[in-house]
Amino acid sequence: VPLSRTVRCTCISISNQPVNPRSLEKLEIIPASQFCPRVEIIATMKKKGEKRCLNPESKAIKNLLKAVSKERSKRSP
């Protein structure tokens, strides 16, 4: 990880843009910790493995989280 320091948040910018759940490879929700005082959401896209930081406060991102958790609950027995 570049620019590594003991206390550092990963997200430099956060995106409000809607993300198509089908284009997602992985969605990481990193809780607040001693390293970063806020929740961070990092989406890994299928296209070229691009990683994008998402705004947890954005309506579009909240909808994405709902859609992903709904999809997960469908899959789990």
Epitope: V1, P2, R8, T10, I12, S13, I14, R38, K48, R52
Partner: antibody
């Protein structure tokens, strides 16, 4: 439209201070990391400093560390560069630039919007 | 710090020709951390490529980026008159640094 406008440049004596400002419009300033980049006359680009979208972290080029401070006021859509103990080699055009949407320490989207620059001349 | 060396320093070509610009890093960097910019005299730089190979919004498809590790390339497939400018590579694998630039001039 999306725009960055720098101000505050001028002629200053060695050892003195100067504060640059960069005013953003046309986008949600509070969700983007921001940079300062400079270009000495007839030379290439030199990265100066970065600040995270919420001001939680900063980083500096070795050449300015301890002398320059980057800060932001998200309520005013404004980025700042406080420059102390100025030297002749700090003479340059200073640009503010926006970090790409969703950039992180794991993936970099480049500096996608730039201001027109403000000129700083350090001379006695 | 990661040092980026661009070559050649100057490239003299005619409109319609192919331009190949090189950027070499002093240590290996992830392709996700490399960008290319174009700068014309008296203007601010413009982002062309991020993530070593992804075109920025509004950039024509004659511009393409490739490479990994320590060697990266910007290719302009057919030079248009407006493409004559200085090109910089930039990395963010550690504190950001720019290469020294390649000037593409009209032959």
């Amino acid at each position: 439209q999306v725009q960055l406008v720098e101000s505050g440049g001028g002629v200053v004596q060695p050892g003195r201070s100067l504060r640059l400002s960069c005013t953003a419009s046309g986008f949600t300033f509070s969700t983007y990391g921001m940079h300062w980049v400079r270009q000495a006359p007839g030379k290439g680009l030199e990265w100066v400093a970065i600040i995270w979208f919420d001001g939680s972290n900063e980083d500096y080029a070795a050449s300015v560390k301890g002398r320059f401070t980057i800060s932001r006021d998200n309520s005013k859509n404004t980025l700042y560069l406080q420059m102390n103990s100025l030297r002749a080699e700090d003479t340059a055009v200073y640009y503010c630039a926006r970090e790409g949407d969703g950039s992180s320490l794991y993936y970099y989207y480049g500096m996608d919007v730039w201001g027109q620059g403000t000129t700083v001349t350090v001379s006695s | 710090e990661v040092v980026l060396t661009q070559s050649p320093g100057t490239l003299s070509l005619s409109p319609g020709e192919r331009a190949t610009l090189s950027c070499r890093a002093s240590q290996s960097i992830s392709s996700g951390y490399l960008a290319w910019y174009q700068q014309k005299p008296g203007q601010a730089p413009r982002l062309l490529i991020y993530g070593a190979s992804s075109r920025a919004t509004g950039i024509p498809d004659r511009f393409s980026g490739s490479g990994s590790g320590t060697d990266f390339t910007l290719t302009i497939s057919r030079l248009e008159p407006e493409d004559f400018a200085v090109y910089y590579c930039q990395q963010y694998g550690s504190s950001p640094t720019f290469g020294g630039g390649t000037k593409v001039e009209i032959k």
